[in-house]
C-alpha cells in the first residue's frame, strides 16, 4: 500500500480467483484513543472499533472511503483504491490502446516546435467518476522539471455504439533550449482513477521524436502564363522554432482530387514555393516536416485549384 | 559564444554540401545497423544515449544562433579553447566566434572518426562478419574535416590488446551512431544557418 495523495491510498493486488489479497492497517488521524468506530462509504454498519482498523482487501467491495468517528463526529477519512495486477501485468482498463505507433500505446504526445512545450492525449470510453493527474520530468534518476497543467476533456466522438472521450494535457519543460541535443528522455506519468480503480500510464520520449509542425500558412497560387502550371507559395507556420535558417523545414506539395484514389501531382521541396500542374476540381495541399530530423509530417494546408 | 548574423557571402559555403552528405551517410549507416543488428538493443528507445564529446567540445553552445543567445537555458556555458584558422567559409569575414564554432565541429568529427576507425578494426575481426562501418560514411567525415581545414594534433587510434567482445562492440556501435546522428543534425542546422546568414 502507498499514499497517492493526502488520505488516498493505493492497494496493489494480485488479481486472480481466490487470491488472498492484502492486509491493510488503517490508523485514525486523531489524538483520541477511545470510543472510535469505523464505517465504509455511506454505510452506517460499524466495521470495527479502536484507533486502528485491520482489513483484508481482496476485491472492489473492500475498497472505498473508510471513516473513523467518535460520538457522531467524523475524525478522519482514508480512501482506498485498488491497483490490479493480472499475470504480472498492471491493468489498463481505463484507457484505450491507440495502437499508434505501436501496440500498447495509451498516451500519445506531440510538440509543434523545439521550445520544450508538448501536448499529450489519451482516449477512454468512460464518461463519469473519472479523474486524471499528470506529472512529468526530464530523466528519471536525477529528474529535471517539467510543468504540466490539468488534464481536460478535449473531444468527444461517437465510435459505433460507443462514445469515446479524448483528454489532453499541456506540459512545458522548465528550462528548455530549442537547440539542445537531448540525451535524457522526457517521462510523462498519468494517474487515472475510475471509481475505486487506480491505474498508471507512462510514456517516455525525446522532444525531437514527437515533433509535428503546424501546417504551412498563407498558401497562395499564381498561374503561369501559357502553361498548365501554377506556382504555389506558402510560409512557415507561426508556431515553428526560429530562426528558420537553423530550424529548417522541408515540404511536400500535392495536387489531388477529392478521392485519395485519384491521380495526383506530387513534388518535394526545401523552398517555400513550387510549380505544379493544377486540375479542375482538384486541390493543392502542402505539408511540412523538419528538414534534418524526420519526425512526423504536419497536417495538410489546402487551397482549391480554381 | 554565438554566431554573428552578418557572416559569409551567400553561396560561399562549401561545408553545407558536405554536412548534408554527412547526415545522409550517418542516417543510412544507422538504418543499416538497426536492420542488421535487429536482435541487439539498437533502437533509440533501447540504447543509453551517450555523448563522447561531452566536456570536450561545446558545439551546441559555440554554434548557437544569435537569436537563441537571449534564451538563458541555452547559455550553460562550457567554454573550451580551440584553434581558429578555419577556411570553410571562403570569406575573410570569419569571426572569432564562428571559428570557435567550426573548430568545435572539427573536433567532434575527429573524435568520432577515431572511435569509428577503432570500432571498425574490431568488427573486422568478428568471425560472424555481421556488420562493418560504411566506408562512404568515413569518407564523408574526412571530406567535411578537410573542408573545415583546421590544423590540430592527430589523435592516435586506440588499439586494444585484449580480445574484443563483439556483442559489446556492436552495442557501442549503435550508441555511437545514434549520438553521431544527433550531432550531424546539429552540424547541418549550423551550416544551413551560416549559409543563410
Amino acid at each position: 500500500i502507498w499514499e497517492l495523495k493526502k488520505d488516498v491510498y493505493v492497494v496493489e493486488l494480485d488479481w486472480y480467483p481466490d487470491a488472498p489479497g492484502e492486509m491493510v492497517v488503517l490508523t485514525c488521524d486523531t489524538p483520541e484513543e477511545d470510543g472510535i468506530t469505523w464505517t465504509l462509504d455511506q454505510s452506517s454498519e460499524v466495521l470495527g472499533s479502536g484507533k486502528t482498523l485491520t482489513i483484508q482487501v481482496k476485491e472492489f467491495g473492500d475498497a472505498g472511503q473508510y471513516t473513523c468517528h467518535k460520538g457522531g463526529e467524523v475524525l478522519s477519512h482514508s480512501l482506498l483504491l485498488l491497483h490490479k495486477k493480472e499475470d504480472g501485468i498492471w491493468s489498463t482498463d481505463i484507457l484505450k490502446d491507440q495502437k499508434e505507433p505501436k501496440n500498447k500505446t495509451f498516451l500519445r504526445c506531440e510538440a509543434k516546435n523545439y521550445s520544450g512545450r508538448f501536448t499529450c492525449w489519451w482516449l477512454t470510453t468512460i464518461s463519469t467518476d473519472l479523474t486524471f493527474s499528470v506529472k512529468s520530468s526530464r530523466g528519471s534518476s536525477d529528474p529535471q522539471g517539467v510543468t504540466c497543467g490539468a488534464a481536460t476533456l478535449s473531444a468527444e466522438r461517437v465510435r459505433g455504439d460507443n462514445k469515446e472521450y479524448e483528454y489532453s494535457v499541456e506540459c512545458q519543460e522548465d528550462s528548455a533550449c530549442p537547440a539542445a541535443e537531448e540525451s535524457l528522455p522526457i517521462e510523462v506519468m498519468v494517474d487515472a482513477v475510475h471509481k475505486l480503480k487506480y491505474e498508471n500510464y507512462t510514456s517516455s520520449f525525446f522532444i525531437r521524436d514527437i515533433i509535428k509542425p503546424d501546417p504551412p500558412k498563407n498558401l497562395q497560387l499564381k498561374p503561369l502564363k501559357n502553361s498548365r502550371q501554377v506556382e504555389v507559395s506558402w510560409e512557415y507556420p507561426d508556431t515553428w522554432s526560429t530562426p528558420h535558417s537553423y530550424f529548417s523545414l522541408t515540404f511536400c506539395v500535392q495536387v489531388q482530387g477529392k478521392s485519395k484514389r485519384e491521380k495526383k501531382d506530387r513534388v518535394f521541396t526545401d523552398k517555400t514555393s513550387a510549380t505544379v500542374i493544377c486540375r479542375k476540381n482538384a486541390s493543392i495541399s502542402v505539408r511540412a516536416q523538419d528538414r534534418y530530423y524526420s519526425s512526423s509530417w504536419s497536417e495538410w494546408a489546402s487551397v482549391p485549384c480554381s | 559564444r554565438n554566431l554573428p548574423v552578418a557572416t559569409p557571402d551567400p553561396g560561399m559555403f562549401p561545408c553545407l554540401h558536405h554536412s548534408q552528405n554527412l547526415l545522409r551517410a550517418v542516417s543510412n549507416m544507422l538504418q543499416k545497423a538497426r536492420q542488421t543488428l535487429e536482435f541487439y538493443p539498437c533502437t533509440s528507445e533501447e540504447i543509453d544515449h551517450e555523448d563522447i564529446t561531452k566536456d570536450k567540445t561545446s558545439t551546441v553552445e559555440a554554434c548557437l544562433p544569435l537569436e537563441l543567445t537571449k534564451n538563458e537555458s541555452c547559455l550553460n556555458s562550457r567554454e573550451t579553447s580551440f584553434i581558429t584558422n578555419g577556411s570553410c567559409l571562403a570569406s575573410r569575414k570569419t569571426s572569432f566566434m564562428m571559428a570557435l564554432c567550426l573548430s568545435s565541429i572539427y573536433e567532434d568529427l575527429k573524435m568520432y572518426q577515431v572511435e569509428f576507425k577503432t570500432m571498425n578494426a574490431k568488427l573486422l575481426m568478428d568471425p560472424k562478419r555481421q556488420i562493418f562501418l560504411d566506408q562512404n560514411m568515413l569518407a564523408v567525415i574526412d571530406e567535411l574535416m578537410q573542408a573545415l581545414n583546421f590544423n590540430s594534433e592527430t589523435v592516435p587510434q586506440k588499439s586494444s590488446l585484449e580480445e574484443p567482445d563483439f556483442y559489446k562492440t556492436k552495442i557501442k556501435l549503435c550508441i555511437l551512431l545514434h549520438a553521431f546522428r544527433i550531432r550531424a543534425v546539429t552540424i547541418d542546422r549550423v551550416m544551413s544557418y551560416l549559409n543563410a546568414s
Partner: antibody, heavy 118, light 107 residues
C-alpha cells in the same frame, strides 16, 4: 492488371509523320496520366511529354514542342502520339507509360520501334 | 532543363557483391528522384520512387538513398538477373529528365 499494348514497328521517310498507338487495359484510361518516352538505339531515355486523358491537357518537352501531338480516345481506351517532320535522329523505340502520379513512370508499354530512313 | 549525371557509366561486379550506383543533380532536387532498371530488349521497370521509397514486388536488395544533389541506388547482393542498365530520373521540374544510365555487368 494494368497493361499497355503498343502498335507495331514503323519505317518512315525523313519529313514524314508517324502516329503510334497505345491501348490500355485493366484500368480506366482517365484514371492515369499517360507519358511518352523514347530511346534511340544504344542511348538513354528521353521524356517527350504527358497527356491527362480526363481533360486532354498536355505538357510537351521543349525539344518536341510544335512537332508532337498527344491525344486519347477514351471510347477505345487508346492513346496516340504523333511526331511530325521526322528526321533520322528520331529513330528510336517509343514507349508509352502510365501512372497515377504525374512525375514518374510506373507501367510501361512494350515499345514501338520507329525507323526514319531515306 | 536539369541534366542528371550518373556514375560510373559501367560497373563490373561479381555476383553476390554489393553494387553502389550514383546519380547527381546540378542543383537541389530534394527527393524528387526515381530509379529504373532496363534489361536488353525490354521496357524499363520502376525500382525506387522519391529517392528511397520501395515498390511492392521489387526485391528488398534494391534500396535508394540521398536528397538534394546526390543519390545512390544500392543493390546489396547482386543476383544474375540484376545485370542490366539503371537509370535515374528527376521529377523536380519539367521537362522530366533521365541520367545517362549505369550498365552493371558481370565481373
Amino acid at each position: 492488371q494494368v497493361q499497355l499494348v503498343q502498335s507495331g514497328a514503323e519505317v518512315k521517310k525523313p519529313g514524314a509523320s508517324v502516329k503510334v498507338s497505345c491501348k490500355a487495359s485493366g484500368y480506366t484510361l482517365t484514371d492515369y496520366y499517360l507519358h511518352w518516352v523514347r530511346q534511340a538505339p544504344g542511348q538513354g531515355l528521353e521524356w517527350m511529354g504527358w497527356i491527362d486523358p480526363e481533360n486532354g491537357d498536355t505538357e510537351y518537352a521543349p525539344k518536341f514542342q510544335g512537332r508532337v501531338t498527344m491525344t486519347t480516345d477514351t471510347s477505345t481506351s487508346t492513346a496516340y502520339m504523333e511526331l511530325r517532320s521526322l528526321r533520322s535522329d528520331d529513330t528510336a523505340v517509343y514507349y508509352c507509360n502510365a501512372n497515377k502520379e504525374l512525375r514518374y513512370f510506373d507501367v510501361w508499354g512494350q515499345g514501338t520501334m520507329v525507323t526514319v530512313s531515306s | 532543363e536539369i541534366v542528371m549525371t550518373q556514375s560510373p557509366a559501367t560497373l563490373s561486379v561479381s555476383p553476390g557483391e554489393r553494387a553502389t550506383l550514383s546519380c547527381r543533380a546540378p542543383q537541389s532536387i530534394s527527393i524528387n528522384l526515381h530509379w529504373y532498371q532496363q534489361k536488353p530488349g525490354q521496357a524499363p521497370r520502376l525500382l525506387i520512387y522519391f529517392a528511397s521509397q520501395s515498390i511492392s514486388g521489387i526485391p528488398a536488395r534494391f534500396s535508394g538513398s540521398g536528397s538534394g544533389t546526390e543519390f545512390t541506388l544500392t543493390i546489396s547482393s547482386l543476383q544474375s538477373e540484376d545485370f542490366a542498365v539503371y537509370y535515374c530520373q528527376q521529377s523536380n521540374s519539367f521537362p522530366l529528365t533521365f541520367g545517362g544510365g549505369t550498365k552493371v555487368e558481370i565481373k
